[in-house]
């Protein structure tokens, strides 16, 4: 009967208690991307720094080959920011002539891969039209939300165009997840 | 042997359990900024409301002189939104003449200061070119991520131009952190 | 005296311990909006999917009639992203003529309703001017922060113009909250 004196009335007595510092967590930071092939009909995935500088993985959360590996089932908060930068797009030149046009765009997707599913699941998407006239432009897209994940799930960040990703600073482009 | 019946198999038995309501937390909201000097080569820091309206600090997390003081080592989720607003920029006037130009920009940085380190560490940066033609413009930059912090670390929010920060509403510009 | 051997020195002995998996949590995803009336002087509220696809509610957190119902007092992290899309705005046409103009805008507000308060409380606002020339445009607004909520509080997401909300994909527009 001991060990339950702190339990609020709505807690089932069999629910596991666990130390917060023991939960799977990762914060990954940007690196220069090397050319790699990607699946057709899918945006290319970014790879990440997992241990240097501000980056870390802990408590059985591991990073390998562009994927964060989920070591334990539960509800995770997942987030990413990608900073893009580019030159004047064709879109802006067409627009200067006054003709409406499907704009250029930048997109970030946080994707879940479950080995038993044939298709990845898109968890989060941030997508933005980019039509800046006559300049170098730069801007971030931020995403973050909570999802129920299963042990063995893998997470990755896909972008519409790897060549537009700002890889110069670890605080500008990053990806993380933690068990709640 | 009591008190461990809920412990999952991967938890070390010496790991501290603690009540969630006891964790350091803060949500700070915008105030009108007073003119203050800032360090050379560093964006000016914002100061904040810490107790009125939606703002609060609790469980030994304190706010003083633009800084959130970290009272306990651990992994923290840190976030901020800054809403900027301004008039037509010079950039847009140059762009109207059709000449590419380095655009004006708005930037938010969440910075960690550790007394034993000579230089602050930039944890998060959101930076965006602003080239809007012929109008008043306004837009937010949002940042959030998890970092391992040490007791005694201090957090602040720096912006590229304090005069562009929208300080009119507590829900538009804010800064917070909580121990995971 | 048992059950406290893991308690760190700063934890009050009467503080409740509880299993993380037992905490109220919800992630809601976008659905096509039906025409509904809304209060004067208040932006219209979105309604949401609460159980299909990526959406879920758990541990007494319920969704009903555009509201997330808070079942337990405490500190919650609340977040939302709304992706907007639209056609060329009047603003851009006026701007082409070179006259400064109050720009069109898109706004997201996360609002708290407490039955004992006559007025809703705006917790978070993301607002952005939109002045894109000659194109279809699209962009997200993301918000997230921590708030102290009371049992019985209700949360909703309001937008400046429901007709501009991208309801096509559950990963583009969403709303969530979880007890810390």
């Amino acid at each position: 009967l001991k060990g339950q004196e702190f339990a609020p009335s709505h807690q089932q007595v069999y629910a596991p208690l666990r130390a917060d510092g023991d939960k799977p967590r990762a914060h990954l930071t940007v690196v220069r991307q090397t050319a790699t092939q990607h699946f057709k009909n899918q945006f290319p995935a970014l790879h990440w720094e997992h241990e240097l500088g501000l980056a870390f993985t802990k408590n059985r959360m591991n990073y390998t080959n562009k994927f964060l590996l989920i070591p334990e089932s539960g509800d995770y908060f997942i987030y990413s920011q990608v900073t893009f930068r580019g030159m004047t797009s064709e879109c802006s030149e067409i627009r200067q002539a006054g003709r409406p046009n499907k704009p250029d765009s930048i997109t970030v997707v946080i994707t879940k891969v479950t080995d038993s599913y044939p298709e990845p699941t898109q968890l989060l998407m941030g997508t933005k039209s980019v039509c800046e006239v006559g300049s170098n432009w730069f801007q971030p897209i931020y995403l973050g939300a909570m999802f129920s994940l299963q042990e063995g799930d893998k997470l990755m960040v896909n972008v519409s165009d790897i060549s537009l990703v700002d890889y110069t600073k670890e605080d500008k482009t990053f990806f993380g997840a933690f068990l709640l | 042997l009591k008190g461990q019946e809920f412990a999952p198999s991967h938890q070390q038995v010496y790991a501290p359990l603690r009540a969630d309501g006891d964790k350091p937390r803060a949500h700070l909201t915008v105030v009108r900024q007073t003119a203050t000097q800032h360090f050379k080569n560093q964006f000016p820091a914002l100061h904040w409301e810490h107790e009125l309206g939606l703002a609060f600090t609790k469980n030994r997390m304190n706010y003083t002189n633009k800084f959130l003081l970290i009272p306990e080592s651990g992994d923290y989720f840190i976030y901020s939104q800054v809403t900027f607003r301004g008039m037509t920029s010079e950039c847009s006037e140059i762009r109207q003449a059709g000449r590419p130009n380095k655009p004006d920009s708005i930037t938010v940085v969440i910075t960690k200061v550790t007394d034993s380190y000579p230089e602050p560490t930039q944890l998060l940066m959101g930076t965006k070119s602003v080239c809007e033609v012929g109008s008043n413009w306004f837009q937010p930059i949002y940042l959030g991520a998890m970092f391992s912090l040490q007791e005694g670390d201090k957090l602040m929010v720096n912006v590229s131009d304090i005069s562009l920060v929208d300080y009119t509403k507590e829900d538009k510009t804010f800064f917070g952190a909580f121990l995971l | 005296l048992k059950g406290q051997e893991f308690a760190p020195s700063h934890q009050q002995v009467y503080a409740p311990l509880r299993a993380d998996g037992d905490k109220p949590r919800a992630h809601l995803t976008v659905v096509r909006q039906t025409a509904t009336q809304h209060f004067k002087n208040q932006f219209p509220a979105l309604h949401w999917e609460h159980e299909l696809g990526l959406a879920f509610t758990k541990n007494r957190m319920n969704y009903t009639n555009k509201f997330l119902l808070i079942p337990e007092s405490g500190d919650y992290f609340i977040y939302s992203q709304v992706t907007f899309r639209g056609m060329t705005s009047e603003c851009s046409e006026i701007r082409q003529a070179g006259r400064p103009n109050k720009p069109d805008s898109i706004t997201v507000v996360i609002t708290k309703v407490t039955d004992s308060y006559p007025e809703p409380t705006q917790l978070l606002m993301g607002t952005k001017s939109v002045c894109e020339v000659g194109s279809n445009w699209f962009q997200p607004i993301y918000l997230g922060a921590m708030f102290s909520l009371q049992e019985g509080d209700k949360l909703m997401v309001n937008v400046s113009d429901i007709s501009l909300v991208d309801y096509t994909k559950e990963d583009k527009t969403f709303f969530g909250a979880f007890l810390l």
Partner: antibody, heavy 124, light 105 residues
Framework: QVTLKESGPALVKPTQTLTLTCTFS??????????VVWIRQPPGKALEWLAH???????YSNPALKSRLTISKDTSKNQVVLTMTNMDPVDTATYYC????????????????WGQGTLVTVSS | DIQLTQSPSFLSASVGDRVTITCSAS?????MHWYQQKPGKAPKLLIY???NLASGVPSRFSGSGSGTEFTLTISSLQPEDFATYYC????????FGQGTKVEIK
């Protein structure tokens, strides 16, 4: 085979700037997942990480020394240069450079080849 | 930011002894590396990523651990093993332990 060699002054005066060069062979700093790291060891004391620079131009410095350190690379010459300003007698140490490498993204960087070190004494 | 504490700092042992050195991290880490240093020489990689033997290192050396507690074990101490051993990790900027000197008893 992989070799690294540190070069620089054996004696510097307090307040002066130390410039050390690491010249290496057997690998290229333009190859993915390669880097060069500087480590120092005061006499009779433990190792201390100073800074490293990676194949993709990322630089990391010990936060406690960051304002004094600069690291740079010349890929064509197979050299990495470390400068440390405002030297003090407590900076007296053997300074090592080493290769950092990892097998793939997700594995951990290791310091698998080291130079023999150069003793730098700070004294007036 | 992450402190590594080795124990013991000094260890006297005889040839053939089983020797265990522990490294405690102030916060959980995923990987620990071990280096061996002999007097007047540069350090040498011994164990990487907690439990992997570096090239050319004898199999009497092994590493284990997770989270905040890591161990280097020498199953049967040989004369050439008398040296100082350092643990190392990269997270939140690289840190070394203070070293464990293994001496002849």
């Amino acid at each position: 085979q992989v070799t690294l060699k540190e070069s620089g002054p054996a004696l510097v005066k307090p307040t002066q700037t130390l410039t050390l060069t690491c010249t290496f062979s057997g690998f290229s700093l333009s190859t993915s997942n390669m880097g060069v790291v500087w480590i120092r060891q005061p006499p009779g004391k433990a190792l201390e990480w100073l800074a490293h620079i990676l194949w993709d131009d990322r630089e990391y410095s010990n936060p406690a020394l960051k304002s004094r350190l600069t690291i740079s690379k010349d890929t064509s010459k197979n050299q990495v240069v470390l400068t440390m300003t405002n030297m003090d007698p407590v900076d007296t140490a053997t300074y090592y450079c080493a290769r950092m490498s990892r097998n793939y993204y997700g594995s951990s960087y290791v310091m698998d080849y080291w130079g023999q070190g150069t003793l730098v004494t700070v004294s007036s | 930011d992450i402190q590594l504490t080795q124990s013991p700092s000094f260890l006297s042992a005889s040839v053939g002894d089983r020797v265990t050195i522990t490294c405690s991290a102030s916060s959980s880490v995923n990987y620990m590396h071990w280096y061996q240093q002999k007097p007047g020489k540069a350090p040498k990689l011994l164990i990487y990523s907690t439990s992997n033997l570096a090239s050319g290192v004898p199999s009497r050396f092994s590493g284990s651990g997770s989270g905040t507690e890591f161990t280097l074990t020498i199953s049967s101490l040989q004369p050439e093993d008398f040296a100082t051993y350092y643990c190392h990790q990269w997270n939140n900027y690289g840190t070394f332990g203070q070293g464990t000197k293994v001496e002849i008893k």
